[in-house]
């Protein structure tokens, strides 16, 4: 097992996932592609927690770049042993992975809360409120109730889709960071056991 290559692969995956999280979160600000609801503050409160932009996005880039940098060959050694420095780097990547776990965990929790509460919308009684808050998330299983939101158009589908995407992306990020914790610990203890000649694809 090549711990450095695995870390780099996780890092590249996290960059892609982080960018998708940022995009999904940004889209939440523009239901149906309209800007007026953000300016009128007619958006779900959980959109303003920036879970995809910060938690699953920017915060995820730090561990991602740390992991990508782990396979660099210019790692300084100690006591004349190159692998010693690489082991230190692998162990330090565990700290970066824990930051990633915190960020992705935040993304998952906020997305789950956003799904459970439902969107802020103009209901069929002409009131702006969290129409589905009292349903304890059961509205998710009954699409016939979604027409209760008359504005923004398709806001329930919009919110459910994007918060579900954030939930899934955050979940994948969480798992990848967890894998890197294990990978980093093993890499730090066992050392880099793959020579420069070995070529393993992640």
């Amino acid at each position: 097992m090549c711990y450095g290559k695995c870390a780099r692969c996780i890092g590249h995956s996290l960059v892609g996932l982080a960018l998708l999280c940022i995009i999904a979160n940004i889209l939440l600000y523009f239901p149906n592609g309209e800007t007026k609801y953000a300016s009128e503050n007619h958006l779900s409160r959980f959109v303003w927690f920036f879970s995809g932009i910060v938690g699953g996005g920017l915060l995820m880039l730090l561990p991602a770049f740390v992991f990508i940098g782990l396979e660099q060959d210019d790692c300084c050694g100690c006591c004349g042993h190159e692998n010693c420095g690489k082991r230190c780097a692998m162990l330090s990547s565990v700290l970066a992975a824990l930051i990633g776990i915190a960020g992705s965990g935040y993304c998952v929790i906020v997305a789950a809360l956003g799904l459970a509460e439902g969107p802020l919308c103009l209901d069929s009684f002409g009131q702006w409120n969290y129409t589905f808050a009292s349903t304890e998330g059961q509205y998710l299983l009954d699409t016939s109730t979604w027409s209760q939101c008359t504005e923004p158009k398709h806001i329930v589908e919009w919110n459910v889709s994007l918060f579900s995407i954030l939930l899934a992306l955050g979940g994948i990020e969480f798992i990848l960071c967890l894998i890197q914790v294990i990978n980093g610990v093993l890499g730090g203890i066992c050392g880099f056991c793959c020579s420069r000649q070995q070529q393993y694809d992640c």
Partner: antibody
Framework: EVQVQQSGPELVKPGASVKMSCKAS????????MHWVKQKPGQGLEWIGY????????NYNEKFKGKASLTSDKSSNTVYMELSSLTSEDSAVYYC?????????WGQGTLVTVSA | DIQMTQSPASLSASVGETVTITCRTS??????LAWYHQKQGRSPRLLVS???TLAAGVPSRFSGSGSGTQFSLKINSLQPEDFGIYYC?????????FGGGTKLEIK
């Protein structure tokens, strides 16, 4: 004062169409959701559908799809309902009601009589 | 569609009395229930929405309660203008459906 004024009674022949209006005043028209409800003589209430004039979001009761058509005209603060292929079953009072911040404001109703 | 069953279909009461009308739904509608009052030859008037929220201008002698599938409307100290037909209606998604009505008559 919020008011919802509906057009007058209609006597129409079977197979014909009728278009009734519902004019709102005393509030911001686009901040209300307009509903239409049918009531046959001596019977209960039946929901036809709603229209949100702000974004033209329309939702129909499946039973009235193809029978009723809802439209709105923001410039005149008016919503319309057209009923097509009329039969004696369509003879009823049709109410429009605006739901918004000041509660629910129902119109006086439009009596539609389908008779040969 | 959600079925609404109102009971009783009719009742007689005197001015000053307290009456309770019940409404049962075929499915859990949480708190999405409204009550209307309609007098002969008039338009319905919204009394209560979201089970217990009184509409603007509705006297405090009216009160709604319940959740899930069982709901009730209580009218304390009946007044002459309270007589007529009462309808319950769910607003949990669409189509909205109404109960068959409860006719409240003067004894």
């Amino acid at each position: 004062e919020v008011q919802v004024q509906q057009s007058g009674p209609e006597l129409v022949k079977p197979g014909a169409s009728v278009k009734m209006s519902c004019k709102a005043s005393g509030y911001t028209f686009t901040s209300y959701v307009m509903h239409w409800v049918k009531q046959k003589p001596g019977q209960g209430l039946e929901w036809i559908g709603y229209i949100n004039p702000n974004n033209d979001n329309i939702n129909y009761n499946e039973k009235f799809k193809g029978k009723a058509s809802l439209t709105s005209d923001k410039s005149s603060n008016t919503v319309y309902m057209e009923l097509s292929s009329l039969t004696s079953e369509d003879s009823a009072v049709y109410y429009c009601a605006g739901y918004g911040n000041s509660g629910a404001n129902w119109g006086q109703g439009t009596l539609v009589t389908v008779s040969a | 569609d959600i079925q609404m069953t109102q009971s009783p279909a009719s009742l007689s009461a005197s001015v000053g009395e307290t009456v309770t009308i019940t409404c049962r739904t075929s499915k859990n509608i949480f708190n999405f229930l409204a009550w209307y009052h309609q007098k002969q030859g008039r338009s319905p008037r919204l009394l209560v929405s979201h089970t217990k929220t009184l509409a603007a201008g509705v006297p405090s002698r009216f009160s709604g309660s319940g959740s899930g599938t069982q709901f009730s409307l209580k009218i304390n100290s009946l007044q002459p203008e309270d007589f007529g037909i009462y309808y319950c209606q769910h607003h949990y998604g669409t189509p909205w459906t109404f109960g068959g009505g409860t006719k409240l008559e003067i004894k």
